[in-house]
Every structure is written in C-alpha cells, then in structure tokens.
Amino acid sequence: IPVIEPSGPELVVKPGETVTLRCVGNGSVEWDGPISPHWTLYSDGPSSVLTTNNATFQNTRTYRCTEPGDPLGGSAAIHLYVKDPARPWNVLAKEVVVFEDQDALLPCLLTDPVLEAGVSLVRLRGRPLLRHTNYSFSPWHGFIIHRAKFIQGQDYQCSALMGGRKVMSISIRLKVQKVIPGPPALTLVPAELVRIRGEAAQIVCSASNIDVDFDVFLQHNTTKLAIPQRSDFHDNRYQKVLTLSLGQVDFQHAGNYSCVASNVQGKHSTSMFFQVVESAYLDLSSEQNLIQEVTVGEGLNLKVMVEAYPGLQGFNWTYLGPFSDHQPEPKLANATTKDTYRHTFTLSLPRLKPSEAGRYSFLARNPGGWRALTFELTLRYPPEVSVIWTSINGSGTLLCAASGYPQPNVTWLQCAGHTDRCDEAQVLQVWVDPHPEVLSQEPFQKVTVQSLLTAETLEHNQTYECRAHNSVGSGSWAFIPISAGARTHPPDE
C-alpha cells in the first residue's frame, strides 16, 4: 500500500503557501484523477511528487495515490484544505445529474474545517430547502441530498457562517431525472361502443407518465384526430386526456379507434371498435341445442346469450307447460354481463322432477322490441315393466307393458326353473320384439310400448321374463306359471 507524506489524513494550509505531496510505494505509483495546472508533477524513483508554489482555495480537495502493480489495489489519500478567509467553498461541479431516489452529491468542499459547525444548504438566493429535504454534510465531499426527488431538482448554494455572517458558494444546479419504467400507461374508454345513427357518443383516451415529457394521440382507423388535450398532475403522475365528443354519429364515425402514447422508453397503444347501427337490435342465441334431454333427477343449466343495444328494459324466464303452472324460481336465474352489449342469462334447474319437463322460454325486451328463445326439455326415464297373462282370441298370451324415455326395446326370455330374473346360464330361448306396439307417445312424457308373447301352453317348471332397455337403463318382469294359474313379479330391487 502506498504512503503519502505528509501523513495526513488532512493538511491545512494558507493561500500562497507551497504544498508538496509525496507518494511512495514498493513499485511505481500514480496520482488519481485530473491534476489541475496549478500543480507540478514529477517522479522520483518509486515515488511521485505533486507540488504547488502558490496554493489557492481551488486546490482544496482529496488527493489519492495508487500503486497500479499492487495486487491488493491499495491506495492512500490526503485531504488538503486551503483556508481562504474570503472563499469558504471550493465548488468542484456546477451541475449534478442524478436519477430519482439516488443520493445527490453537491460537491462544495469546505476550505476550512473549523467552519463545519456553521454550514447549511439553501436554495438559490438563500431560499429555504424544500420541505422534507433530507441531507447530510461531509467536509471532504460536500452536501448529500438523500433519495433525491424530482421536485428537488433546483439551484442550490452552500452556506458557511464566517464571523457571524453567512457566506454562500457559487450555485450548483441539481437535475433529478425521473426513472421512466416504460411507455406511458393508457386507458381507452369505453372498450367498445355501439350507437344508433344520430345519437351522441364519447370516446376518452388518457395516458399517464412519471414525467411531463410524453405524447398522446387518438386515431380513427388510420387518421390522427385533432382533439384538444387536457393535462393534469395526479397521484404523482402526469395525465394527458383526449376526449372525442360526437353530437350525432353517422356511419362514417364507425371503425377502429386507437389511443397511442409514447415517451423515451417507447410506444404503447390500445384500441376499441365503434359500431354505428341503423336501429335498435336485440339478438338471442344459445350455444346449447334448443332441444334438451336430461335424465330425471339430474340437473340442467339453460344458457342464453343476449346481444342488445340499447340495454335491456326487461327480461325473464317462463315455463310454458305442459305439466303445471309453476314458474322458475328467480333465485335460480342468473345474469352475467360479459361486456357492455353482451350478456349471459342462465336458468339453473337442479334435480329435475317429472312435472318440470316441457318448454322454457327466455324473453327479453329493449327499445327494439321483444325477443324470445324457447328450450324444449324432455326427461329421460329408465323403463318400468309389468307383465300380465291374458287370453286373446282364445289363445293364452303374455302381455308386457314397458314405459320409459327414450322408447324402450323389448326382449322376452325363457329360462329353466323358477327365478326372479333369468341369468345367462339358465336361458333356454330369447325372442326379440322388433316392433312393440306404441300405446302412448305424448310430448315430454314417457313412451309406453306393449309386446305380446303367445304361448299355447306355458311350461310349469319355466320362467318367462320380459326385459325392456333404453339409453337410461333397463327393467324386467318375470312370469312363473303355477298349477293354480300364474304369478308374476318384478325382480327384487
């Protein structure tokens, strides 16, 4: 590590005196920074000597010496004060530039350490500092404004008390630059707009930025619009607002509107679409099929999408029958707005009962008139089966009635022994009825079909089973001939 003679760390001299600073190291040494013309610099073996024959207040500063060959990069420093009774300050720079929230060093160096107790920092012409200016002072370096703010970018003077009066330095201009994180923030409202020809409309493009240097414009398709700009300062940001007001819109006003703002960091834009229509409109649609089938006991949500302008004046869900005069509970109806002109209406039908099958209609109204969208809801049921023994035209006949939805198909089975249900191993014979007779087929109701099995003689040690099946499930009924007639029963649950 190099060594400076005199040993310091401070040296106080009077103006006009000769000052010699010698730096000695193991190898070659050099003085840091630009050396002013007032100094003479010469080398003497492993030492470097700075000398001046006429010290002035401008020589006040810290002198640092380094040894370039030293792997530890050591240095030595001495601070020289040239105490001039007329010049308490040596200002090293007249302008300082920092970014906001950085510490700003105002390099006014005190020429006499004795004056330290009476120093202060003021704005130009002795004005007090801005409120909450947090600063500290170092006689070697000057005043530090901590975490400088944009509005603290001012002209400052360093003040020292000498013989009961304040002596000011020349001024130092501090420029505090805002840290611009990116392009200005933008809003364009509304996000979309629909108007009937002849109505009024307003589109507002606003941009905000951390500093005042930014531009904003509103453009229609590819045309830049000439709109007066309103400026404001709010929440520590600069705002610029462009408002396009149209008294009576026409089709030429329709199209794409872009709000564009730019600053040193770049450009940011956002767009919206303005639609001009001839008259009010109201469109209802659904992503669902309007004919719905649901298994009894399950739930269903009916969803309708509405596109409308002007807004809806009324809407409701109605049950149109055919089973009862009940109406959907309002709590089961839900409305959500996707955006200004599009809405979704949902009717929740939980745990559907047989009496809730039928037609459900969503009705909506706006100045364009009424519109309705109707869903047809059919419930699916697993088949219910019953078998009876009857005589038709003198012939013994097994008559199987199956009821369900969708329409059940019917299969007869004959199996050995008496059983509630034929299993595969016992089956002796299978008859599939390709065309059972439809007894009833009303909308939204179960379909009832009938199948006949004609048997001249029924074998007593056999079971005859009617099975019905549809997409929901299956049902069956077993018939066991007995000597005293016949008995029928459904299988055990």
């Epitope: 007090p128 500092l129 801005l130 409120r131 909450h132 703010k149 944009f150 509005i151």
Partner: antibody, heavy 120, light 111 residues
Framework: QVQLQQSGAELMKPGASVKISCKAT????????IEWVKQRPGHGLEWIGE????????NYNEKFKGKATFTADTSSNTAYMQLNSLTSEDSAVYYC?????????????WGQGTSVTVSS | DIVLTQSPASLAVSLGQRATISCRTS??????????MHWYQQKPGQPPKLLIY???NLESGVPARFSGSGSETDFTLNIHPVEEEDAATYFC?????????FGGGTKLEIK
C-alpha cells in the same frame, strides 16, 4: 381505515407540563410524518412541528423550539407531544395529522383534537 | 416564513350558487409545474378535512362540486353548486418549505 385518536382534554396550571398522545391505526405508522398543529380562536392554524416515527427525525417551527418536544413509540403506534412551562398563550386545541414524506403531500388525515386550557 | 393571505374573510352565498375563495402567497409555491398548495374544510368542533391537494387534485371521497386552480402565488377554491352542508371555514396551506403555513381562513355561510 386510517384513524388518528388523540387523548382527552386537559386543564393545566401555569408553569406545568402536559403530554398529549396520538394513536395511529390503519396504515404503516413508521412511514408517515406525524404533524402537530395548534389552533387558537382568532389565530388560525399554526404548525408546531413533526416527527417521523420510523427514524425519530424531528423538525420544529422556530417559534415552538423549547416549548414542544415530540416522541413516538412504534410498538404502540403512538406519537406524543409534550408542552412545557405552560402559559395562557398555550391554551388551544392541538391536532395531530398524518403527512407522507415529501413536499408534494398535504396533511391528509387529522386527529379529533385535544383541548388544553391553562388557568390558575 | 411564507405568508398566505385568504380573501374574503367571510362570504355568504345562496344555495346552488358559486362560492370562490382566494389564497395569495408571499412567495411562489410552484415548482416544476407542481403547485404545493392544499385546501381544507373545517366545521365547528371538528378537525380540518382535506379537500384539494397540489392546487387542483380532488381528495378521494370529496364531492366534485369542489375544485381548485392556480399557480405560483395565486390560488382559488371554487364550490359550485353550493349546498347546505358546505357551511364551514376553509383554509389554504403551503407545503413547499418549512414551516408549513396556513391562510387565515374564510368562513362560508349559506343564504
């Protein structure tokens, strides 16, 4: 929500000292200055000074140096102002108010005020 | 210290009309386009309530009938249309340098 709750009214003898408290809730106490303001009928509003609870930094109006002393307890989010050597001139309503760090900012929330009456 | 002079000291305004209060400062309180002037409303027995900050910015929750304008040394508070509940004393305050100072107040009466 931000609230500043001040201690109750005080009736004091001349020459005595009084300590007024201001309890802050609803914001980060250490990050905002607590301002103290005096109001006397016919004298308007006068700024006494301020304290930044996080650092203990204080600034006093020259006029009130030696009269007022500010302290703050960050564990209880409470700021205090002590007024000493009371005279009839100190009879007033004293307010605490919150102020963010920087010239840009106003005193956005105020306590309800503490009335101090100095009478023999 | 910066001196703030408010005028008038009192005024009476009819319901629904405009009230205009002026505040003049002994030094400029504007810096880099920011005006360090704030307005407060005070009703009897209550603390001051912030209405406008940085000359023209409406504090959250304050009705839009209050507005502020001005720069450098001349500032104005406008209330339009005046409502019954606006009867109060209004103060301006500068925050550019210590000590912060207040205007003497303007008492608004509703006719």
């Amino acid at each position: 929500q931000v609230q500043l709750q001040q201690s109750g009214a005080e009736l004091m003898k001349p020459g005595a000292s009084v300590k007024i408290s201001c309890k802050a809730t609803g914001y980060t106490f250490s990050s905002y200055w607590i301002e103290w303001v005096k109001q006397r009928p016919g004298h308007g509003l006068e700024w006494i000074g301020e304290i930044l609870p996080g650092s203990g930094s204080t600034n006093y109006n020259e006029k009130f140096k030696g009269k007022a002393t500010f302290t703050a307890d960050t564990s209880s989010n409470t700021a205090y102002m002590q007024l000493n050597s009371l005279t009839s001139e100190d009879s007033a309503v004293y307010y605490c108010a919150r102020n963010y760090d920087g010239s840009l900012y106003p005193m956005d929330y105020w306590g309800q005020g503490t009335s101090v009456t100095v009478s023999s | 210290d910066i001196v703030l002079t408010q005028s008038p000291a009192s005024l009476a305004v009819s319901l629904g009309q405009r009230a205009t209060i002026s505040c003049r400062t002994s030094e400029s309180v504007s810096i880099h386009g920011t005006h360090l002037m704030h307005w407060y409303q005070q009703k009897p027995g209550q603390p001051p309530k912030l209405l406008i900050y940085a000359a023209s910015n409406l504090e959250s929750g304050v009705p839009a009938r209050f507005s502020g304008s001005g720069s450098e040394t001349d500032f104005t508070l406008n209330i339009h249309p005046v409502e019954e509940e606006d009867a109060a004393t209004y103060f301006c305050q500068q925050s550019i340098e210590d000590p912060p100072t207040f205007g003497g107040g303007t008492k608004l009466e509703i006719k």
